[in-house]
Structures are given as structure tokens and as C-alpha cells.
């Protein structure tokens, strides 16, 4: 099976590689602007120049193109705690991350929050912190992962997956309220 | 205590328009940044959109943006989310929540209202 083709590609795939047919006339091959540059107007002929015009301030394109606008520059959401990693340029978007000891967490394909790394208190740091994945954390006995941090077997209840982990804990409390001792 | 309670949701045509809100109490609504996640049925939960603390700059998920419009009013401690041009793919309980802090999940979300788009 042949893979379906949307029309621009159909017509950008009957000239060579970095030119693209003209929208009027499908015997004319332009040459594609440049990254950072957007089509103003076709060229007017073969082996004519295409109109290119450098991207205004706030946008830009990355790549060869015959886009009739450059795209917007991305801002940082600053209430999700990005900062700016480098600034927008007329051929590369903003870049956005996030601060030291932090890590990204990916809510959806496009859209980041920042959150600190666990330190992995009550317990050992399994694999380190990285620029989208939290700590994992191993805990120590008697600590349970919640949340990924380490929290003490004692608020542990017997309706939580934390049971098996805590079990000798929870069976030892029991023991010491059924005794009767004072 | 902490209190989030969403209304509006109902059963709509495709095409229809529905307004949802999220009543707010228990700490300082003026001060947080809200959001708007749904579920679908069998789904996990979708990020659909958030409004920062004094409204600008909403974002959108793309299967909503151009439909959807979220606002909120500070003064009625409220959240909306306006929805036009309903799809069946719209179809889920639709939840507020305060922005997580702490981690990826939901310290404080409401119990959610069903949002049915069927002909």
C-alpha cells in the first residue's frame, strides 16, 4: 500500500529535494526559503528567485520552508515553573526547562511542569534525579514509598498497598494493643 | 478544608455548547492556578486546560483549542469552562483542580461532573 499523501506533499514531492511547486503553476519549481525566512511571494519563473523575507521579531522558522508566516516564538509558563533556557531566535524557538534540582513531568505532549527532585529522606537514592524523571528512592526499613518519599511504616493502614512492606510493623502494633499491658 | 465542586455537565448534541464551573473554598482561590481534567470512559486523566492566578495566558490542550475557553472570577471565587462545538470525543467527567505543587498528581481536585455528547 502506497502511503497517503496530503496535497503539499503530493506537489512538494514532483520537484527535487529543497524546492517546492508553484501554487499556480505546476511546471515551476521554487527553491524553498531558508531557515529564518518565510515566502513572500513565489518565484516568478524557472531558475527565479523565491521572495524570502527574514522573520519578524517574536517568530521564526526552523527549517527550509514555504510557509506564508513565520510561527510564534513559545513562552515559558512561569506558573508552571519553566524558566527560559535560551531565548527565541528568528530560526530556533524558545527553549524552555526547568531550574536546578528540578525535573520536567510531562502533563501532555506539549505542556511541562516543573517539580524539585526527591532528596529521599529515610532512604537511598536508587537513580538519580534526571531532566524528566524524578529520584527513585529505596527506603529504609520501616518506611514505606509514598508520593516517592519515605514515610513511616507507623502511618501505614491496613486498607494501603504499603501493608506488605510494613507487615512485621503492623503485626507488632497489633500485638502490643491486643496484650492488654500496660 | 480544602472543597471543590464542579456543575453543568449534562447530556448535549454534538455541535451544542455547555458552561461548567467550579465552586472554590477553603483557602486563598485569588492565589492559585486552576485547572480544568477530564476523563474519559476506560481513559486515564487528560490535561484539557489551566488559567494562572490573575487569568492570563490560559492554556489549551490541542483536541479543545479554538473550542474551549476557560475563565475564572476572583471575586466569586469560580471557575468556568466555556465548551462549544461538543464532540463525542468530548464525552468524560470533567474535574477542577488546584495546579499540583508538591508532585505529579492531584492534591485537591473536585468530585467531577458528566459531560455526555450523543445524538
Known amino acids: 500500500l502506497v502511503p497517503h499523501l496530503g496535497d503539499r506533499e503530493k506537489r512538494d514531492s514532483v520537484c527535487p529535494q529543497g524546492k517546492y511547486i508553484h501554487p499556480q503553476n505546476n511546471s515551476i519549481c521554487c527553491t524553498k526559503c531558508h531557515k529564518g525566512t518565510y515566502l513572500y511571494n513565489d518565484c516568478p519563473g524557472p531558475g527565479q528567485d523565491t521572495d524570502c523575507r527574514e522573520c519578524e521579531s517574536g517568530s521564526f522558522t526552523a527549517s527550509e520552508n514555504h510557509l506564508r508566516h513565520c510561527l510564534s516564538c513559545s513562552k515559558c509558563r512561569k506558573e508552571m515553573g519553566q524558566v527560559e533556557i535560551s531565548s527565541c531566535t528568528v530560526d530556533r524557538d524558545t527553549v524552555c526547562g526547568c531550574r536546578k534540582n528540578q525535573y520536567r513531568h510531562y502533563w501532555s505532549e506539549n505542556l511541562f511542569q516543573c517539580f524539585n527532585c526527591s532528596l529521599c529522606l529515610n532512604g537511598t537514592v536508587h537513580l538519580s534525579c534526571q531532566e524528566k524523571q524524578n529520584t527513585v528512592c529505596t527506603c529504609h526499613a520501616g518506611f514505606f514509598l509514598r508520593e516517592n518519599e519515605c514515610v513511616s511504616c507507623s502511618n501505614c493502614k491496613k486498607s494501603l498497598e504499603c501493608t506488605k512492606l510494613c507487615l512485621p510493623q503492623i503485626e507488632n502494633v497489633k500485638g502490643t494493643e491486643d496484650s492488654g499491658t500496660t | 478544608e480544602v472543597q471543590l465542586l464542579e456543575s453543568g455537565g449534562g447530556l448535549i448534541q454534538p455541535g451544542g455548547s455547555l458552561r461548567l464551573s467550579c465552586a472554590a473554598s477553603g483557602f486563598t482561590f485569588a492565589h492559585e492556578t486552576m485547572v480544568w481534567v477530564r476523563q474519559a470512559p476506560g481513559k486515564g486523566l487528560e490535561w484539557v486546560s489551566h488559567i494562572d492566578r490573575v487569568g492570563q495566558d490560559p492554556y489549551y490542550a490541542d483536541s479543545v483549542e479554538g473550542r474551549f475557553t476557560i475563565s475564572r472570577d476572583n471575586s466569586k471565587n469560580t471557575l468556568y469552562l466555556q465548551m462549544n462545538s461538543l464532540r463525542a470525543e468530548d464525552t468524560a467527567v470533567y474535574y477542577c483542580?488546584?495546579?499540583?505543587?508538591?508532585?505529579?498528581?492531584?492534591?485537591?481536585r473536585g468530585q467531577g461532573t458528566l459531560v455526555t455528547v450523543s445524538s
Open positions: 483542580a488546584l495546579l499540583p505543587k508538591r508532585g505529579p498528581w492531584f492534591d485537591y
